[in-house]
Interface confidence: low
């Protein structure tokens, strides 16, 4: 299709070398009021929708993104040349930087509506470079942690080294929603909640005598708790002991529950103690089966092919620890009789 | 740019307190842990432990018993006690920012940003 | 807490020369070891992170590998500027420890 009518926007991204951080476009497609290129019906005021991105469809995934190569050839399926670049609904998520991700993006409604509909596109052009700004080393970071019941605050880290007298008015998106009232490059957080967590954007406008474009840089927002105070404990086994059939095959369960740590390394595992002798087993990874904000919950099984008459006089220990201390339980094997 | 000045006392008496406190200047101390490590003379680095500007905090096991770290986020400044000090206490105290550092589904922290240090001598 | 060895304590070499400073933790820490350089008189640099990731600013003359227990730091032609001390940290568990310094010395 011919993108020459589509309206043009230009973003800044200045990545940090430090860290994985996140990109995202929107597919700003212009507002009915404020633009020929989409012919839409008109809204009534109290229909405004609060996604300030994609005010022209109805259908928030029906969006179709392309990125225009420098070098003329035609325009290219983002979904099947950049597997570091994933479209979610209106929104365009690049998961990593890189100077590789400077171009056109250009995004359209996948279903066009009517003839008007065909100029009804935005391109991007998108402008990524490394932060060089020595004076603005130490920016916030693209991950912000905000304790749970406390006060806090959600910096821009575009603008983390301006005053705030300094800054220019900011806008705020989180998960893609425009936040109307936060205008300055912080955002102040009376009393932090777990909905709070989230992907956060800050866009502000820089000019020179030429043109205008806009900086966006995405913070992840982790809502936390204050690290355990406590060791982990066991869930699961129960019972000291366990009865089983000789011959047959085994699977003991080992679950426990760790509470949050900010540097988490937890241990789960499982030794045998035999008469004087006690060694650790080879079993299956742990794995999480649950996660939440104040713990998590891990698991990890011992196998045993056949239960042996030797097993009987064996005790199976499942060990935990986190940085506070160890806990352990043992179970002794019983024969069903 | 974010800077960390430190003030406090360069000697302390034996079995008192010894106090010092960390200025943060050109940002913000929110959302950031501040750290404490010291340095006795002539030898390497020994963390003393952390502060989220909310206030939770985490120690050295070794010190735990004779430090308090605290934070005033309206002076943008976290401070640090270490009481019963005794000769061994001698050392030059810095004072952090511990940084998480973004993989994709883990934090890696590492303090990027130091105070300029302060020599403390415990000597009656 | 985890122990951090470094080896060699100190080591005399010339400008150009390429040097190899190692630590060994004494359990596995993943990748959770940074670097720091240290001069007289001055705090801490911070050089690099997650055992190989360079700091930005810092000179790709410096680079670290090594994963576990066994890391290393090199410098691939020294600078008359590298001459200090560097310490290993590891940020696996708690406490955070530090590994007690190599000094580099002009040979």
């Known amino acids: 299709f011919n993108i020459s009518g589509c309206s043009t926007k230009k973003l800044l991204w200045t990545y940090s070398t430090r860290s994985e951080e996140e990109f995202v476009l929107f597919c700003d497609l212009p507002e009915p009021q404020k633009s020929h290129f989409c012919h839409r019906n008109r809204l009534s005021p109290k229909q405004v929708p609060e996604h300030l991105p994609f005010m022209g469809s109805n259908d928030l995934s029906d969006v179709q993104w392309y990125q225009q190569p420098s070098n003329g050839d035609p325009l290219e399926d983002i979904r099947k040349s950049y597997p570091h670049i994933i479209q979610d609904k209106c929104t365009l998520h690049f998961l990593t930087p890189g100077v590789n991700n400077s171009g056109s993006y250009i995004c359209r409604p996948k279903m066009i509506k009517s003839p008007y509909d065909v100029a009804c596109c935005v391109k991007m052009i998108l402008e990524v470079k490394p932060q060089t700004n020595a004076s603005c080393e130490y920016s916030a970071s693209h991950k912000q942690d905000l304790l749970l019941g406390s006060t806090g605050s959600i910096s821009c880290p575009s603008l983390s080294c301006q005053s705030d007298a300094q800054s220019p008015a900011v806008t705020w998106y989180k998960n893609g929603k425009l936040l109307s009232v936060e205008r300055s490059n912080r955002i102040v957080v009376d009393e932090v909640y777990d909905y709070h967590q989230g992907t956060y954007v800050c866009d502000y406008t820089q000019s020179d005598t030429v043109s205008s474009w806009t900086v966006r840089a995405v913070v992840q927002v982790r809502t936390i708790v204050g690290d355990t105070k406590l060791k982990p404990d066991i869930l699961d086994p129960v019972e000291d002991t366990l009865e089983v059939e000789l011959g047959k095959p085994l699977t003991i369960s080992c679950k426990a529950r760790f509470g949050f740590e900010r540097v988490f390394n937890p241990v789960i595992k499982w030794y045998i103690k035999d008469s004087d002798l006690e060694w650790e087993v080879s079993v299956p990874e742990a794995k999480s089966i649950k996660s939440t904000l104040k713990d998590e919950i891990i698991e990890r099984n011992i196998i045993l092919e056949k239960v042996t008459q030797r097993d009987l006089r064996r005790k199976f220990v499942c060990f935990v620890q986190n940085s506070i201390g160890n806990t352990t339980q043992s179970v002794q094997l019983k024969e069903k009789r | 740019q974010v800077q960390l000045q430190q003030s406090g006392p360069g000697l302390v008496k034996p079995s008192e307190t010894l106090s010092l406190t960390c200025t943060v200047s050109?940002?913000?101390?929110?959302?950031?842990?501040w750290s404490w490590i010291r340095q006795p003379p002539g030898k390497g680095l020994e963390w003393i432990g952390y502060?989220?500007?909310?206030?939770?905090?985490n120690y050295n096991p070794s010190l735990k018993s004779r430090v308090t770290i605290s934070v005033d986020t309206s002076k943008n400044q976290f401070s640090l006690k270490l009481s019963s000090v005794t000769a061994a206490d001698t050392a030059v105290y810095y004072c952090?920012?511990?940084?998480?550092?973004?993989?994709?589904?883990?934090?890696?922290?590492?303090?990027?940003?130091w105070g300029q240090g302060t020599t403390v001598t415990v000597s009656s | 807490a985890i122990q951090l060895t470094q080896s060699p304590s100190s080591l005399s070499a010339s400008v150009g020369d390429r040097v190899t400073i190692t630590c060994r933790a004494s359990?596995?820490?993943?990748?959770?070891l940074a670097w720091y350089q240290q001069k007289p008189g001055k705090a801490p640099k911070f050089l690099i992170y997650?055992?190989?990731s360079l700091e930005s600013g810092v000179p790709s003359r410096f680079s670290g590998s090594g994963s576990g227990t066994d890391f290393t730091l090199t410098i691939s032609s020294l600078q008359p500027e590298d001459f200090a001390t560097y310490y290993c940290?590891?940020?696996?568990?708690?406490?955070?420890?530090f590994g007690q310094g190599t000094r580099l010395e002009i040979k």
């Open positions: 359990q596995g820490i993943s990748s959770a």
């Open positions: 952090a920012r511990d940084v998480g550092i973004a993989a994709r589904n883990s934090y890696y922290y590492v303090m990027d940003v």
């Open positions: 940290q590891q940020f696996n568990s708690y406490p955070i420890t």
């Open positions: 050109g940002g913000s101390i929110n959302n950031y842990y």
């Open positions: 502060i989220f500007y909310s206030g939770t905090t």
């Open positions: 997650d055992a190989s």
